[in-house]
């Protein structure tokens, strides 16, 4: 099982010193986002139990294997559910925390039930503020069951659950009508998927026999043991205060483990930690009780004391759990609770042991799952142990499973049972990924996803020319890091492998697929310089360059120009195809604006030095506009305009242009040129008579500019209809502008 | 989907007797209080008894109790209403009615309501 | 036992009228115990309205339930056709007792 708890503080005077903290044991926990460790995520589960919306609340993360959730404000922010989920891929696992409230009008009995497929579950609601009304229970947030008042049996509410099936697993709830639902007494059922004692697919294999209140898992038949005890059965105690799968962590604060609520994976649940009891885990265990929540009974014989964390602690000359073997009988000494071995190895294990009279080689054997009794090679007899030595022949995967060291000497007999993992070692399942290349190196990505067992513990990266018969060449990289493979051939493709190993003899595992990655093309290395540029229009620029002479081919497939306009901070960038190309015309330009310019000589991907950089200025795109601009009706077909020339001119005006419109009109508008730059005023003739116009005027230098204000003005009447407006007599001769 | 099916109804003279079944499918029937609601031609809704889903405890009206009696079978998605010493007054239509409990929103408190119904059954007391 | 009178016992309106109509409790009723059902002649009640205010599945949006205490209404907004009918108030206190019932009749 991975190795993630979930602690939650359960001194509730004060809500905001509440927290709820995940920790995990596991290599690589929280790492990151990355493919060797998903970080670890601390939540409320609002999809069952709903509270009222309150501020969010405060996620810390000490390291990378512990995140603590905080900034509760009321009591009603702590009732429902929380998660945490640590562990990676197929090991991803949600620890589930059930919280209620101190002062619920019911509370649970026994708030985690963990039982077997098929059992009897009975959740138990223990009335604290009696209500005369219904009860209601509620499964997963649904609707479940009703139970009148009047059905309370010793002040409890009992939900009976015969013949519970897995997916009978899940939150339950007991709630008064009427009440609020943070009244409630919330449960969480977990139904293992065997019945009891058993695990695996179809429920066949037989569970290690899992002491002091450890829960087989029935997928992989190992003990989830409660906290504060460790080894492949929890038959070894942790020092007090200490927690985790190998009791590496320890509880917070002064008082160890009081007041602790410790959430461990399913089918384990929640309890409180070795030598403490009660709803809020603050009551030490009574004389005689030990263990997680008290639950265990220590019977210690042959003077044998007991300890509330631990259990018996023997006197000397006295072993076993009860205190009940004598140390005459033979007795396996520091086995480890679980090794791991690499697939297709060879291992060496040993097995010491101690008794009188004194073992002997022939009287140690190792027994396989599969039943194979593996006898030992050779024996180090010691004064005070003997350790047998076994040669196992090559694993396989169905080694994996629970071995037996046994001795057996006239005085008795003695085993241990052991976990031997065999991993598989990784096999990359895809090609590492090219990040950058330039000319003589490749930047690669070396994380992949890979089939059989983490953790990696190294990285190697082979690579040769394509279509070449060398040796490989290997390089040796930090898994979380990409690699630079450098001092390759420019323009040439190298076929690139990863290969991942994990710990121990035997963990590399086989090349992963090849792919092609191909060095960049040289860096073109000639600076070109700008020999002159000529304003062209107010958006309209001829460059011209030059590149200095060297011999041999021109290294390049083009050029590209840059303009940086400053004012708005935008590039302009103009690629000119040919390496012989010298000049360009950029155009679209923006009037008015002061450029800086450089070119450079591009090839294939890669840019040459720029060339030192000009800086031009484009002439305004035209004039600002007439002032004072003024109509008055000469006749029944003249309107006279009258104007002021415009201030701050960058020139000399080559024309102004009329724009005439009948008010309300829907016809385009007509533009009269005006070719006497000097004039202040013209005469529009060949209006309509008792005709209400329109005008405006603009200036032209380069470009045109901006329009003047717009004036209104009638012809007077009794006039013919005339042909349309004109401007002096010349206008006639030389058209209209439309 | 949800249905119950009322049955048993018919004539009988006072001082006799009746007894009424609902059968029930498309819901797990043993988790759901049951209802027998009665109405009386022209006349309003009378709630007459309810049951809990163990069937250990039963409620009355003052007008039925120590004459009728609600009772379930569970194994058959059955509900009950022997009727004994029966007078002209219980003459009704009969019907018997499923109470759901309702989060009448995300936090507040459960709230009770009689969601789906019989089509009923007549039970005519006449000599 | 608790009793629920409602009021008035019959309502003449018209299709697109606003419908108004009363329930009061003989002693204070939790609002999460008062339902509202509607009947139409020759069928089963349906549930319209429970924990005084909430609509069940289905119900249009133009009927509401309000009050606490003593005093509740159910309020149809706009009349529809459909919504002339026999509607009962109803408690799940002490005893699950219902109202007399008010006729919604087309004026």
């Known amino acids: 099982a991975v190795d993630l708890t979930l602690l939650a503080n359960l001194r509730l005077t004060d809500p905001q010193r509440f927290f709820l903290t995940c920790v995990s044991g596991e290599a690589g926990a929280g790492r990151g986002s990355d493919a060797w460790g998903p970080p670890l995520l601390l939540e409320k589960d609002d999809r069952i139990v709903r509270t009222p919306p309150g501020p969010p609340l405060r996620l810390a993360r000490n390291g990378s294997h512990q995140v603590t959730l905080r900034g509760f404000s009321k009591p009603s922010d702590l009732v429902g559910v929380f998660s945490c989920v640590g562990g990676a891929g197929a090991r991803r696992t949600r620890v589930i925390y059930v919280h209620n409230s101190p002062g619920a009008h019911l509370l649970p009995d026994k708030v985690t039930h963990t039982v077997n497929k098929g059992d009897t579950a009975v959740l138990s609601a223990r009335v604290h503020k009696e209500k005369q009304t219904d009860v209601i229970w509620k499964s997963n947030g649904s609707y479940f069951y009703t139970l009148d008042w009047h059905e309370a049996q010793d002040g409890r509410f009992l939900l009976q659950l015969p013949n519970v099936q897995p997916p009978s697993s899940g939150i339950y709830s007991a709630t008064y009508l009427e009440a609020s639902p943070l009244g409630s007494a919330f449960f969480r059922l977990i139904v293992r998927g065997c019945g009891a004692g058993r695990w695996g697919p179809g429920c066949t294999k037989e569970c290690p026999g899992c002491l002091h209140g450890g829960v087989c898992h029935d997928h992989d038949g190992e003990c989830v043991c409660p906290p504060g005890f460790t080894g492949t059965r929890c038959e070894q105690a942790c020092r007090e205060g200490r927690f985790g799968q190998s009791c590496q962590e320890q509880c917070p604060g002064i008082s160890g483990c009081r007041g602790l609520t410790f959430c461990l994976p399913d089918p384990y649940g929640c309890s409180c930690g070795s030598g403490w009891r009660g709803s809020q885990c603050q009551e030490a265990c009574a004389p005689g009780h030990f263990g997680a929540d008290c639950r265990l009974q220590c019977q210690c014989q042959n003077g044998g004391t007991c300890d509330r964390f631990s259990g018996c602690v023997c006197p000397s000359g006295w072993h076993g759990v009860h205190c009940e073997k004598s140390d005459r009988i033979p007795q396996i000494l520091n086995m480890a609770s679980e090794l791991e071995f690499n697939l297709e190895t060879m291992p060496r294990i040993n097995c010491a042991a101690a008794g009188n009279p004194f073992p002997v080689r022939g009287s140690i054997e190792l027994r396989k799952p599969d039943g194979t009794v593996l006898l030992s090679t050779k024996a180090i007899v010691e004064p005070e142990k003997t350790t047998a030595e076994f040669e196992v022949p090559r694993l396989v995967l169905a080694d994996s499973g629970f071995w037996e060291c046994r001795v057996s000497t006239s005085g008795g007999q003695d085993s241990r049972r052991f976990k031997v993992n065999v991993k598989v070692p990784p096999v990359p399942l895809a090609a590492p990924r090219l990040l950058t290349k330039q000319s003589r190196q490749l930047v690669v990505s070396p994380l992949v996803s890979f089939s059989g067992d983490g953790p990696i513990s190294t990285v190697r990266l082979h690579y040769r020319p394509q279509d070449s018969t060398m040796d490989w060449s290997t390089i040796v990289v930090d898994p979380s890091e990409n690699v630079t493979l450098m001092n390759l051939r420019p323009k040439t493709g190298y076929s690139v492998r990863v290969q991942l190993s994990r710990p121990g003899e035997g963990g590399e595992g086989a090349w992963g697929p090849p792919t092609l990655m191909t060095t960049d093309c040289p860096e073109p290395l000639l600076q070109p310089w700008l020999e002159g540029w000529h304003v062209e229009g107010t958006d309209r620029l001829r460059v011209s360059w030059s590149l200095p002479l060297v011999p041999g081919p021109l290294v390049g497939d083009g050029f590209l120009l840059r303009l940086w306009d400053g004012t708005r901070g935008q590039e302009r960038r103009e690629n000119v195809s040919s390496p012989q190309a010298r000049t360009a015309l950029l155009t679209g330009l923006t009037p008015g604006t002061h450029y800086q310019l450089d070119v450079q000589l591009y090839h294939c991907t890669l840019l040459g030095p720029a060339s030192p950089p000009a800086h031009v200025l484009l002439p305004p795109s035209g004039p600002p506009a007439p002032r004072h601009l003024h109509a008055q009706a000469l006749s029944d077909s003249e309107i006279q305009l009258t104007w002021k020339h415009p201030e701050a001119l960058p020139g000399p005006i080559s024309k102004y242009v009329v724009e005439v419109q009948v008010a309300g009109g829907a016809g385009d508008p007509l533009w009269i040129d005006v070719d006497r730059p000097e004039e202040t005023s013209t005469i529009i003739r060949g209006l309509n008579a008792s005709t209400r116009y329109l005008f405006r005027m603009r200036a032209s230098i380069q470009g045109l500019g901006d329009w003047s204000n717009t004036v209104e003005e009638s012809t007077l009447g009794n006039g013919l209809q005339a042909e349309g407006p004109v401007q002096e007599s010349r206008a006639a001769e030389e058209g209209l502008d439309q | 989907e949800v249905q119950l099916l009322e049955s048993g109804g018919g004539l009988v003279q006072p001082g006799g007797s009746l007894r009424l079944s609902c059968a029930a499918s498309g819901f797990t029937f043993s988790g759901y209080v049951m209802f027998w609601v009665r109405q009386a031609p022209g006349k309003g809704l009378e709630w007459v008894s309810g049951?809990?889903?163990?069937?250990?405890?039963?409620v009355y009206a003052d007008s039925v109790k120590g004459r009728f009696t609600i009772s379930r079978d569970n194994s058959k998605n059955t509900l009950y209403l022997q009727m004994n010493s029966l007078r002209a007054e219980d003459t009704a239509v009969y019907y018997c009615?499923?109470?759901?409990?309702?989060?009448?929103?995300?936090?507040?408190?459960?709230?009770?309501?009689?969601?789906?119904w019989g089509q009923g059954t007549l039970v005519t007391v006449s000599s | 036992d608790i009793q629920m009178t409602q009021s008035p016992g019959t309502l003449s309106l018209s299709p697109g009228e606003r419908a108004t109509l009363s329930c009061r409790a003989s002693q204070s009723v939790s609002s999460s115990y008062l339902a509202w059902y509607q009947q139409k002649p020759g069928q089963a009640p349906r549930l319209l309205i429970y924990?005084?205010?909430s609509r069940a599945t289905g119900i249009p949006d133009r009927f509401s339930g309000s009050g606490s205490g003593t005093d509740f209404t159910l309020t149809i907004s706009r009349l529809e056709p459909e919504d002339f009918a026999v509607y009962y108030c109803?408690?799940?206190?002490?005893?699950?007792?219902f109202g007399q019932g008010t006729n919604v009749e087309i004026k």
């Open positions: 049951i809990y889903p163990s069937g250990g405890w039963t």
């Open positions: 009615a499923r109470v759901n409990y309702y989060d009448s929103s995300g936090y507040g408190p459960i709230a009770p309501g009689l969601d789906y």
């Open positions: 924990g005084a205010s």
């Open positions: 109803q408690q799940y206190g002490s005893s699950r007792t």
